[in-house]
């Protein structure tokens, strides 16, 4: 905290300008009027205040707005945002996407800080849902944003927002998150034709059930191995050799290189060796000929 001292004669700031950078911290405290600062916040970012001087400016705003800053001030915080704590931000009511963008710009190129996480949380909660424009903005600044949300939080994403999602935005999502996002994507893209639909849905397929994979296998989609390897193991296991062959198309040859990795390894163990041999890839580990396969889960269901 800066001590209260009288402003030296002739140093009272008539406006917020660059002459203030040469003021000592106590002079800034004594000679800059908080109300003037609030009305001229748009100038602050263009002035090369030091990080220490920004402390004083923050202190002045805190005194002026003990219940939290108005959006007119928040919008122009610029580098002052770096001085805010999550506790400060929880007092704010940010409704404008432009304000959000302006503050995210300050943190650009850095990992998501607790301040940014709190800001986003406040903004999204205020909006009630993660709409397309917000998601567009957030994933532009933080490609991993979507995958940082819990499945519960993702459930509030409307299907219309899925159009804003790029493949790289899903890179770090786990199966539980894709389980939530996939049905939304399916709904969002349902009116697209086959090949266009596959291009859009491809990055969400880690959440697809068996019946959807079976349906895709009938559409000559030629799924690449990278996508196939991200599918849910439980969704892949019931697929027949013929269905996998149709699903992968020319990429089926890549199964050989992945035969020791999930889900390929587990899928191989469920197939008849005879059927695997028809692929001509030398895949080993299938069920030997003459063995009877009992589906115990089916038996339990019948009893």
């Amino acid at each position: 905290e800066v001590e209260k001292t009288a402003c030296p004669s002739g140093k009272k700031a008539p406006e917020i300008d660059e002459s203030l950078i040469f003021y000592k911290k106590w002079e800034l405290e004594a000679c800059v009027d908080a109300a003037l600062l609030a009305t001229q916040m748009d100038r602050v970012n263009a002035i090369p205040f030091t990080y220490e001087q920004l402390d004083v400016l923050k202190h002045k705003l805190d005194e002026l707005y003990p219940q939290g800053y108005p959006e007119s001030v928040i919008q122009h915080l610029g580098y002052l945002f770096l001085k805010m704590s999550p506790e400060d931000i929880r007092k704010w009511n940010v409704t404008s996407l432009e304000t959000l963008k302006a503050l995210l710009e300050v943190n650009k190129g850095h990992e998501m800080s607790p301040q940014v996480a709190t800001l986003i949380d406040r903004f999204v909660k205020g909006r009630g849902q993660l709409d397309k424009d917000t998601l567009d903005t957030l994933t532009a600044f933080y490609p991993g944003y979507l995958c940082s949300l819990s499945p519960e939080e993702l459930s509030s994403v409307p299907p219309s927002s899925i159009w804003a999602v790029r493949p790289q935005d899903l890179d770090t999502c786990d199966p539980r998150q894709l389980d939530v996002l996939y049905p939304k994507a399916r709904l969002a893209f349902q009116n697209m034709n086959g090949s266009e639909y596959f291009v859009k849905i491809q990055s969400f397929l880690g959440g697809a059930p068996t019946e959807d994979l079976k349906a895709l296998s009938q559409q000559n989609v030629s799924m690449d191995l990278a996508t196939f390897m991200k599918l849910r193991t439980d969704a892949v296991l019931p697929l027949t050799v013929a269905e996998v062959q149709k699903l992968l198309g020319p990429h089926v040859e890549g199964l050989k290189a992945e035969e020791r990795h999930r889900p390929v390894r587990d899928w191989i163990l469920r197939q008849r060796q005879d059927d695997l041999d028809t692929l001509g890839l030398g895949l080993q580990g299938g069920i030997p000929n003459g063995y009877l396969v009992l589906d115990l889960s089916m038996q339990e269901a019948l009893s």
Partner: antibody, heavy 119, light 107 residues
Framework: QVQLQQPGAELVKPGASVKLSCKAS????????MHWVKQRPGQGLEWIGM????????NYNEKFKSKATLTVDKSSSTAYMQLSSLTSEDSAVYYC????????????WGTGTTVTVSS | DIVMTQSQKFMSTTVGDRVSITCKAS??????VAWYQQKPGQSPKLLIY???NRYTGVPDRFTGSGSGTDFTLTISNMQSEDLADYFC?????????FGAGTKLELK
């Protein structure tokens, strides 16, 4: 990558002026302040001042106010510093440097220009 | 103006040593201090910023510490390529000021 290119050396006569250049590449020139720093042989570094290429706004160390004039040419992404009324005290290496805002430490330095004032 | 004092102009060292270079500010600068390394004929290179944060690509044998008026740059395992001049800089207030430098030499 981010680079600040400066001419290697300038030989000037006492009383004359010299205009040093600093050509920026690898980043958006108009988005960063450009600072200038002086280093005399075997001595420390002295901050001269800074200019914002977008606005042309300048701020000087009081000590160099009557010695240095900072300008920019946005079209060529080049910053300039004119030094006037040169004396042997001005013989030094001059660096341009890009700061990290709002912390004002320098993550990118120019290659430096050695100014020699001699008759 | 804030004066940054590096009391040792020269320091003798050997490879493998732990070396501590000090810098004292004439008034409180918080943690607004950076450290630079400069080799002969080269530009300064940023090592440490905000008193203790290592800049990208700087080996972890370099560490910075301190706040207020007293700051230290430590090289935990001196290497021959670390022989250079080291400068501190404060960015708490204008004008920005630097220390006079400490030159590391071989014993």
């Amino acid at each position: 990558q981010v680079q600040l290119q400066q001419p290697g050396a300038e030989l000037v006569k006492p009383g004359a002026s010299v205009k040093l250049s600093c050509k920026a590449s690898g980043y958006t020139f108009t988005s960063y302040w450009m600072h200038w720093v002086k280093q005399r042989p075997g001595q420390g570094l002295e901050w001269i001042g800074m200019i914002h290429p977008n606005s042309g706004s300048t701020n000087y160390n009081e000590k160099f106010k009557s010695k240095a004039t900072l300008t920019v040419d946005k079209s060529s992404s080049t910053a300039y510093m004119q030094l006037s009324s040169l004396t042997s005290e001005d013989s030094a290496v001059y660096y341009c440097a890009r700061p990290v805002v709002p912390y004002w430490y320098f993550d990118v330095w120019g290659t430096g220009t050695t100014v020699t004032v001699s008759s | 103006d804030i004066v940054m004092t590096q009391s040792q102009k020269f320091m003798s060292t050997t490879v493998g040593d732990r070396v501590s270079i000090t810098c004292k500010a004439s008034q409180n600068v918080g943690t607004a201090v950076a450290w630079y390394q400069q080799k002969p004929g080269q530009s300064p290179k940023l090592l440490i910023y905000s008193a203790s944060n290592r800049y990208t690509g700087v080996p972890d044998r370099f560490t910075g510490s301190g706040s207020g008026t007293d700051f230290t740059l430590t090289i935990s395992n001196m290497q021959s390529e670390d022989l250079a001049d080291y400068f501190c800089q404060q960015s708490s207030s204008y004008p920005l000021t630097f220390g006079a430098g400490t030159k590391l030499e071989l014993k």
